[in-house]
């Protein structure tokens, strides 16, 4: 029950996160005009990943797309790429996780397959969240760098007579949406990975024939060279694969009078 809840909650949290990443990517307010020195402005500038906008105080808003691809800064292209990769991975993760949900029955899908799918989607969500956080952080770093550069030469005088005020940009709403959304997707992914551990099926698929004798319980393993005594047998039911071969960790062998080398 707890596993189903963890998986379901992970799915919902990731869904919200990916919706947020998509929203952030589409938003125009990645950077907004800094209004620190002038809280009331007649012309307000803001920029997104895909277009820049100007909102005039009278109500008119005009947006212009970045119609050039080669003319754009490499950092902006990198941020676009990170956000798109995040969305794509998140979308695939959502698709996979829908089929992996324990509450949904699809044919005769085994729990082991669901566990694998849950883990896959969890990893995808984690990478998706990291991509979004990285993208937003790269953009934020770019803004901080440009902000201090423009502050350094904020007023460029023309013969000391005319002032040209350089527009400075600060963090827009999209950055905060992106950070939160990326974080949620990451958390959702971790929850899916945790749920995966609980979904891993108990070992019941035995290919060995057990013979129970009084005093010692001896398991005959076809193809195996050792017999475990009752003292050394694992209390947990571990899956024995074809051939009965196990790793040293799986079978502890204790010396007894039945052991022959």
């Amino acid at each position: 029950m707890a596993v189903t809840a963890c998986q379901g909650l992970g799915f919902v949290v990731s869904l919200i996160g990916i919706a947020g990443i998509i929203a952030a990517t589409c938003m125009d307010q990645w950077s907004t005009q800094d209004l620190y020195n002038n809280p009331v402005t007649a012309v307000f500038n803001y920029q997104g990943l895909w277009r820049s906008c100007v909102r005039e105080s009278s109500g008119f808003t005009e947006c212009r797309g970045y119609f050039t691809l080669l003319g754009l800064p490499a950092m902006l292209q990198a941020v676009r790429a990170l956000m798109i990769v995040g969305i794509v991975l998140g979308a695939i993760g959502l698709l996979v996780s829908i089929f992996a949900l324990k509450c949904i029955r699809i044919g005769s899908m085994e729990d082991s397959a669901k566990a694998n799918m849950t883990l896959t989607s969890g990893i995808m969500f984690i990478v998706s969240g990291l991509c979004a956080i990285a993208g937003v952080s790269v953009f934020a770093n770019m803004l901080v760098t440009n902000f201090w550069m423009s502050t350094a030469n904020m007023y460029t005088g023309m013969g000391g007579m005319v002032q040209t005020v350089q527009t400075r940009y600060t963090f827009g709403a999209a950055l905060f949406v992106g950070w939160v959304a990326g974080g949620l997707t990451l958390i959702g992914g971790v929850m899916m990975c945790i749920a995966c551990r609980g979904l891993a099926p108990e070992e019941t698929n035995y290919k060995a024939v057990s013979y129970h004798a009084s005093g010692h319980s001896v398991a005959y393993k076809p193809g195996g060279f050792k017999a475990s005594t009752g003292f050394g047998s694992n209390t947990k039911n571990k899956k024995i694969y074809d051939g009965g071969a196990r790793t040293e960790d799986e079978v502890q062998s204790y010396p007894s009078k039945h052991d022959y080398v």
């Epitope: 005009q33 002038n38 009331v40 402005t41 007649a42 012309v43 500038n45 803001y46 920029q47 820049s52 906008c53 100007v54 005039e56 105080s57 009278s58 109500g59 008119f60 005009e62 212009r64 005319v162 002032q163 040209t164 005020v165 350089q166 527009t167």
Partner: antibody
């Protein structure tokens, strides 16, 4: 097309409050414009007083800010100007105007002359 | 406040001739976000309210004859009437709309020589 018409008393006594109303027709006062008041003393240039925008936010000329109030009545599709403690220097033709693209005044009222005299 | 200074104060031009009015601002009116200059030109005839001719320094308002044109960027702007007509006799004002408070030039009176 938006049409504007100013109304109010033509004569106001010094130290009293000047009150003018602008009635908007052919458009809604809640639409995406700013609704301005501008004045022009006889034989002189134009001075922007302030505006109330589509969301009800007001912005005033700092030189008049302490004396000016611009408000609106969406039910009557009107906006109004109140200028307190008037003096003879406030004698002017008062215009209401709509600003939009380029923050430019695209529609104007005919104007109303307000004289401040005792 | 941004101070707008127009020159000349008055201008007498023959019919059919070119009339040029200059407007200078104390600060740049160029917005980096859209590369537009926030300057408008108005025409005011006696007893009438001003009429918008040009906005964004060079965009002609609809219904305005194409003999009116605006140019300039940053701090220096020009209104040109390519061929003066009798009905163009008026006072012309420039207005900055980039920074509050919005301010007007003192006006330029255009007359027929």
């Amino acid at each position: 097309q938006v049409q504007l018409q100013e109304s109010g008393p033509g004569l106001v006594k010094p130290s009293e409050t000047l009150s003018l109303t602008c009635t908007v027709s052919g458009g809604s006062i809640s639409s995406n414009y700013a609704w301005n008041w501008i004045r022009q003393p006889p034989g002189k240039g134009l001075e922007w007083i302030g505006y109330i925008n589509y969301s009800g936010y007001t912005n005033y000329n700092p030189s008049l800010k302490s004396r000016v109030t611009i408000s609106r009545d969406t039910s009557k599709n009107q906006f109004s100007l109140k200028l307190s403690s008037v003096t003879a220097a406030d004698t002017a033709v008062y215009y209401c105007a709509t600003s939009y693209y380029g923050n430019s005044f695209i529609y104007w009222g005919q104007g109303t002359l307000v004289t401040v005299s005792s | 406040d941004i101070v707008m200074t127009q020159s000349p104060d008055s201008l007498a031009v023959s019919l059919g001739e070119r009339a040029t009015i200059n407007c200078k601002s104390s600060q740049s009116l160029l917005n980096s976000g859209n590369q537009k200059n926030y300057l408008a030109w108005y025409q005011q005839k006696p007893g009438q309210p001003p009429k918008l001719l040009i906005y964004w320094a060079s965009t002609r308002e609809s219904g305005v004859p194409d003999r009116f044109s605006g140019s300039g960027s940053g701090t220096d702007f020009t209104l040109t009437i390519s061929s003066l007509q009798a009905e163009d006799v008026a006072v012309y004002y420039c207005q900055q709309a980039y920074s509050f408070p919005w301010t007007f030039g003192q006006g330029t009176k255009v007359e027929i020589k």
